[in-house]
């Protein structure tokens, strides 16, 4: 598959996972910022990554998860809802060596993570702390509590066009 | 669609070594972690151990360590179990089983149909 | 290790009939229970995840729930396929453990 980036001729190879959808053909940058590709008429902003009809935005500036589900909020998207397998496989294969903040928040009362789509999250979340209610992915090969008031970069994430 | 298949019956005398394997297909192999499952003729199911198959460490159930080792053949998408030493108490049928680490949902959803091991001088 | 205490290991019930099978956990395993069917040739297919959540394809006379350490598996209406062996699994923590298994039989 292809994931599109900031590369010369408007998009990059990466490593295939299986039930990524298939891009063909071409693309190219349009002069709104969009880059295509010409077969699905799919499209990402520029700067964001695509996979299976989705967009990505890895930042590179830092804030608090609060700060971070607002700026997502700005661009038209939401925290980053990490919530297969092969999508966490695809976002740890194109983050750096940093803490991004998720869409994944503890909810005290339930003793439970939920997505911010409320639904539930069965799952391993390393690092848990009773002052850690938000996560973060980017540095192991899971899920990180982290404190909601200390800065990380952050993944957005939205409907590709 | 995901399958696991798994490498047909075996026929093994006391002392020999056996070697089974579950290819899997359908989905990305390294993503997932591979448990392995004994199963005595007429009893219940017990639980091996799991390997995991980005980094290819395994971890074994108490009554495994020893005589069992999982492997890997990450380009073939592959997963072995091998047995050294059989004992007639090996004879049984084993499965793989797919399973996340992270995602519990996703633990144990695909099972390989199973190899028949006969252990008998 | 957590002991799975599956109940009971036979059943003999009659098409249409509604029957349910019962895992008790020796801790506390949460939400993390399968429930597995196997059919006479081996096939082990899961039905339940996470308590009380459908496999795709199962068919919606299946269902799982849980009472503080019990968990349940119901067959609201039995068809002549349901009649196999049933397993309940705990991923809460390792080792991994099974329970004993039911075998439903058509009465």
């Known amino acids: 598959p292809q994931i599109f980036n900031k590369s010369n001729d408007g998009f990059t190879t990466t490593r295939s996972y299986g039930t990524v959808s298939q891009i063909f053909g071409s693309s190219s940058p349009s002069p709104n910022g969009f880059i295509t590709t010409r077969s699905y008429g799919t499209v990402c902003p520029k700067d964001w990554e695509f996979y299976q009809a989705r967009c990505f935005f890895l930042s590179t500036s830092e804030s608090s998860w609060n700060e971070s589900r607002d700026f997502c909020k700005g661009k038209g998207s939401t925290l980053a809802i990490v919530n297969t397998p092969e999508k966490l496989k695809f976002l740890q294969d194109i983050t750096d060596a940093e803490k991004y903040f998720i869409g994944l928040i503890y909810h005290r009362e339930e003793k439970r993570w939920r997505w911010i789509n409320n639904s539930v999250f069965n799952g391993n979340v390393t690092n848990q702390n009773q002052n850690f209610n938000c996560a973060t992915i980017g540095l192991t090969k899971t899920f990180d509590a982290a404190s909601c008031d200390i800065s990380y970069r952050r993944i957005c994430e939205k409907n590709a066009k | 669609q995901i399958q696991l298949v798994q490498s047909g019956p075996e026929l093994k005398k006391p002392g020999e070594t056996v070697k089974i394997s579950c290819k899997a297909s359908g989905y990305t192999f390294t993503i997932y972690a591979m448990n392995w499952v004994k199963q005595a003729p007429g009893k219940g199911l017990e639980w091996m151990g799991w390997?995991?198959?980005?980094?290819?460490?395994?971890t074994y159930a108490d009554d495994f360590k020893g005589r069992f080792a999982f492997s890997l053949e990450t380009s073939a998408s592959t997963a072995y179990l091998q047995i050294n030493n059989l004992k007639n108490e090996d004879m049984a049928t084993y499965f793989c089983?797919?399973?996340?680490?992270?995602?519990?949902?996703?633990?144990?959803?695909?099972w390989g149909q199973g190899t028949a091991l006969t252990v008998s001088s | 290790d957590i002991q799975m205490t599956q109940s009971p290991s036979s059943l003999s019930a009659s098409l249409g009939e509604r029957v349910s099978l019962t895992c008790r956990a020796s801790q506390d395993i949460g939400s993390s229970l399968n429930w597995l069917q196997q059919e006479p040739d081996g096939t082990i297919k899961r039905l339940i995840y996470a308590t009380s959540n459908l496999d795709s394809g199962v068919p919606k006379r299946f269902s799982g729930s849980r009472s503080g350490s019990d968990y349940s598996l119901t067959i609201s209406s039995l068809e002549s396929e349901d009649f196999v062996h049933y397993y309940c699994l705990q991923y809460a923590s390792s080792p991994f453990t099974f329970g004993s298994g039911t075998k439903l039989e058509i009465k």
């Open positions: 390997i995991n198959t980005d980094t290819g460490e395994p």
């Open positions: 089983a797919r399973s996340s680490e992270v995602f519990y949902d996703y633990r144990f959803d695909y």
